[in-house]
């Protein structure tokens, strides 16, 4: 909000990509002057309260648990801070996605999964029977929504030139533009290994 910088943070304590019936903990940054912190979900431009925490003197960042994740709980979340009757602040938004609503796509690579820094690899996500119009590539353990997204079918994700940080387990998901927070089951996993050394044995997981 104008003049109210920096914007308070909101974060998921685990991945914001949550399986159906799973759970996630959301943390709102504590605002000193707020007497009440509310977690809101935004659906069709309407704000609905999910939970509230009154201020306590031993203030820590208020946490909210979203459990039994489903289509109704997927979407954009925001922390609303009540400073007074007519004074509020708002955090940034956090997007939560629910998975397991459609059949899983298939993830494949155009080369071997052990790479040297600087090399390129392309991962392809496809679905033979479900006409998804969007695909997302997710890396296991990431605490933010996948940055890699494609509107093509099949979807090609170019990872490169790679560095050591690219190492990890990858899965892809299919979804529809009209329901951007409802994703498919995860695809098969591919483990990419980026190494300086070519003298070790690596196995790939599929």
């Amino acid at each position: 909000q104008e003049g109210d910088f920096p914007m308070p943070f909101i974060s998921a304590k685990s991945s914001p990509v949550i399986p159906l019936d799973g759970s996630v903990k959301i943390q709102c940054q504590a605002i000193r002057e707020a007497y009440l912190t509310q977690l809101m979900i935004i659906k069709n431009s309407t704000y609905r309260e999910i939970g509230r925490r009154l201020k306590f003197w031993n203030e820590t960042d208020p946490e909210f648990v979203i459990d039994h994740m489903d289509a109704n709980k997927a979407g954009r979340y925001q922390c609303q801070y009540r400073i007074g009757h007519y004074r509020f602040r708002y955090s940034d938004t956090l997007e939560l996605v629910v998975t397991g609503l459609y059949g899983k796509p298939f993830l494949s690579a155009d080369r071997g999964l052990v790479l040297m820094p600087g090399e390129n690899i392309s991962l392809t996500c496809s679905s033979a029977h479900i006409p998804f119009d969007r695909f997302s590539l997710a890396k296991e353990g990431e605490l933010s929504l996948p940055q890699h997204q494609s509107g093509e079918h099949p979807a090609n994700f170019s990872l490169g030139p790679v560095d050591l940080n690219v190492s990890g387990i990858y899965r892809c998901y299919g979804w529809y533009n009209r329901s951007p927070y409802l994703w498919s089951f995860p695809s098969n996993a591919l483990e990419l290994v980026v190494t300086d050394s070519i003298h070790q044995d690596y196995t790939t997981q599929n």
Partner: antibody
Framework: QIQLVQSGPELKKPGETVKISCKAS????????MNWVKQAPGKGLKWMAW????????THTDDFKGRFVFSLETSASTAYLQINNLKNEDTATYFC???????????????WGQGTTLTVSS | DVVMTQTPLTLSVTIGQPASMSCKSS???????????LNWLLQRPGQSPKSLIY???KQDSGVPDRFTGSGSGTDFTLKISRVEAEDLGVYYC?????????FGGGTKLEIK
């Protein structure tokens, strides 16, 4: 500059409905609250409602529940006051006023529309 | 509700002379954020209200320096150092600390 421009005067019969608009310009609409204030002829100012323009949630006094609908069209930076089943005592000038919402000093300043005169008469 | 009491009801002043009006609230207007949400408005005859002072003493843009607001807690004052013809109208104080917002009954400034 900051402006709140309200719709024109209205002449209605008892039982009818009126919808008054207040179009804001010169600032980010969602960052400041919107108020509606009633002034009956020859009387003082009476606060009706405050709308959190960020969420669209209205807060109003018991005197203005039921027949009164406070709404927003955020994309058009416009607030609306709708009064259903009009009564003679609704005859007044209605003002919108920007105030509140943020925690900055700017949010504590008030800006007023020019007013909309509503006459309810059979 | 917080009651805002303005005195006097009517103030008759000669042009060039000072004027002072009072606004008292039934509860302290100091909010938990340390601010006091007390504003003053002027409503000239046939016009919409115009903001003069916000947060007790801060002058709104375009408001002449002859207007000053002061006070704290429950007692507030608006002073005009030298009244001009354009100052006539009804002056309202209002509070935005407590729900619901409430206005004073107004002080009518007339020119003698």
């Amino acid at each position: 500059q900051i402006q709140l421009v309200q719709s024109g005067p209205e002449l209605k019969k008892p039982g009818e409905t009126v919808k008054i608009s207040c179009k804001a310009s010169g600032y980010t609409f969602k960052n400041y609250g919107m108020n509606w204030v009633k002034q009956a002829p020859g009387k003082g100012l009476k606060w009706m409602a405050w709308i959190n323009t960020y969420t669209g949630e209205p807060t109003h006094t018991d005197d203005f529940k039921g027949r009164f609908v406070f709404s927003l069209e955020t994309s058009a930076s416009t607030a609306y006051l709708q009064i259903n089943n009009l009564k003679n005592e609704d005859t007044a000038t209605y003002f919108c006023a920007r105030w509140g919402l943020g925690t900055t000093e700017e949010a504590a300043r008030d800006y007023w529309g020019q007013g909309t005169t509503l006459t309810v008469s059979s | 509700d917080v009651v805002m009491t303005q005195t006097p009801l009517t103030l008759s002043v000669t042009i060039g002379q000072p004027a002072s009006m009072s606004c008292k609230s039934s509860q302290s207007l100091l909010d938990s954020d340390g601010k006091t949400y007390l504003n003053w408005l002027l409503q000239r005859p046939g016009q919409s209200p115009k903001s003069l002072i916000y947060l007790v003493s801060k002058q709104d843009s375009g408001v002449p320096d002859r207007f000053t607001g002061s006070g704290s807690g429950t007692d507030f004052t608006l002073k005009i150092s030298r009244v001009e013809a354009e100052d006539l109208g009804v002056y309202y104080c209002w509070q935005g600390t407590h729900f619901p917002q409430t206005f004073g009954g107004g002080t009518k400034l007339e020119i003698k």
